[in-house]
């Protein structure tokens, strides 16, 4: 079969998921596509415990996650329900701020330097985290 019992090389296993942490930056859509080509998705945070795990690995650096409101309501890229799910926004966020001068508001969510979330312009080149569920990961992925 195509199911895996361990994570690919250079991915980190945690609670039946595999995570890969970039050390360079891309716009949100490009980061999203990068993960998809790895049969993964931008990280979806479903608990405080997962939040702390990701936060530990990324450090105090702006980092994209798989949450956006580009089509209206906030949505997780894997379909996890946003309204009833875990949230960790900074105070006063998300604010869809238009004052940045880059056109439009802020439609993509990222971890800030303290781990709490902020919405920002999706074109900003932030680091990103890919996640794939262990039982879904395909065989012998390439070295990343």
């Amino acid at each position: 079969g195509s199911e895996r019992t361990c994570c690919p090389v250079n991915w980190v296993e945690h609670e039946r998921s595999c995570y890969w942490f970039s050390r360079s930056g891309k716009a949100w859509a490009d980061a999203d596509n990068y993960c998809r080509l790895e049969d993964a998705h931008l990280v979806v945070v479903t608990s405080w415990e997962e939040q702390k795990f990701v936060q530990h690995h990324i450090g105090p650096v702006n980092t994209w996650m798989g949450l956006h409101d580009q089509n209206g309501p906030w949505k997780w890229v894997d379909g996890t329900d946003y309204e009833t799910g875990f949230k960790n926004w900074r105070p006063e966020q998300p604010d869809d701020w238009y004052g940045h001068g880059l056109g439009g508001g802020e439609d993509c969510a990222h971890f800030t330097d303290d781990g709490r979330w902020n919405d920002d312009v999706c074109q900003r080149p932030y680091r990103w985290v890919c996640e794939t569920e262990l039982d879904k990961a395909s065989q012998e992925p390439p070295l990343l």
Partner: antibody
Framework: EVQLLESGGGLVQPGGSLRLSCAAS????????MNWVRQAPGMGLEWVSV????????YYADSVKGRFTISRDNSKNTLYLQMNSLRAEDTAVYYC??????????????WGQGTLVTVSS | DIQMTQSPSSLSASVGDRVTITCRAS??????LNWYQQKQGKAPKLLIY???SLQNGVPSRFSGRGSGTDFTLTISSLQPEDFATYYC??????????FGPGTKVDFK
């Protein structure tokens, strides 16, 4: 030996169809996202399409979107490109290429020898 | 889309020469830049990825530099087998990886 071998090219009339194949050997095909890249005669390189490792995600250049379909059969270590509604400007050598991903950077590290597609009446 | 330009479009050089090719991106692509070599009638070959990382098996006379919008490929001492066309490629916009128009290196 790591190898990609394209086949299926040839002469086709405008509006016609063609299916290209790319057979992989010497590496774990299912571990890599795969691309098609083309090169018109005497011209530069143009990325055409990519497919994820499992085949669940596909992307296309605007110039071929809606006309070309990329697919793969990991059990056969083979990549495909179904080309419909072909136009004269699709005339090119078509290469398959594997996606190297290192620390967030991506490149095409293994290339086939190419197969020539000529669209002409 | 991100546009890539290269200069010069062609150059003539002799064996032993130091050759430098420039690539420019229409926007900041950080270090997401690859270089390929293509000989007549053959498939391209990856030389350098991530702006400066040498691909396995590529001679050390090839080197890449740059970040942001401006990049260079240098061949420190041109060898007979290096006469070819060289392409840069951005990999910032996953997966819309656009190539430069190429630089042809031929005999002086």
């Amino acid at each position: 030996e790591v190898q990609l071998l394209e086949s299926g090219g040839g002469l086709v009339q405008p509006g016609g169809s063609l299916r290209l194949s790319c057979a992989a050997s010497g590496f774990t095909f299912s571990s890599y996202a795969m691309n098609w890249v083309r090169q018109a005669p005497g011209m530069g390189l143009e990325w055409v399409s990519v497919i994820s490792r499992s085949g669940g995600y596909t992307y296309y250049a605007d110039s071929v979107k809606g006309r070309f379909t990329i697919s793969r059969d990991n059990s056969k270590n083979t990549l495909y490109l179904q080309m419909n509604s072909l136009r004269a400007e699709d005339t090119a050598v078509y290469y398959c290429a594997s996606r190297l991903a290192v620390a967030g950077s991506e490149a095409f590290d293994i290339w086939g020898q190419g197969t020539l597609v000529t669209v002409s009446s | 889309d991100i546009q890539m330009t290269q200069s010069p479009s062609s150059l003539s050089a002799s064996v032993g020469d130091r050759v430098t090719i420039t690539c420019r991106a229409s926007q900041n692509i950080s270090s997401y830049l690859n270089w390929y070599q293509q000989k007549q009638g053959k498939a391209p070959k990856l030389l350098i990825y991530a702006a400066s990382s040498l691909q396995n098996g590529v001679p050390s006379r090839f080197s890449g530099r740059g970040s942001g919008t401006d990049f260079t490929l240098t061949i420190s001492s041109l060898q007979p087998e290096d006469f070819a066309t060289y392409y840069c490629q951005q990999s910032y916009r996953t997966p819309l990886f656009t190539f430069g128009p190429g630089t042809k290196v031929d005999f002086k």
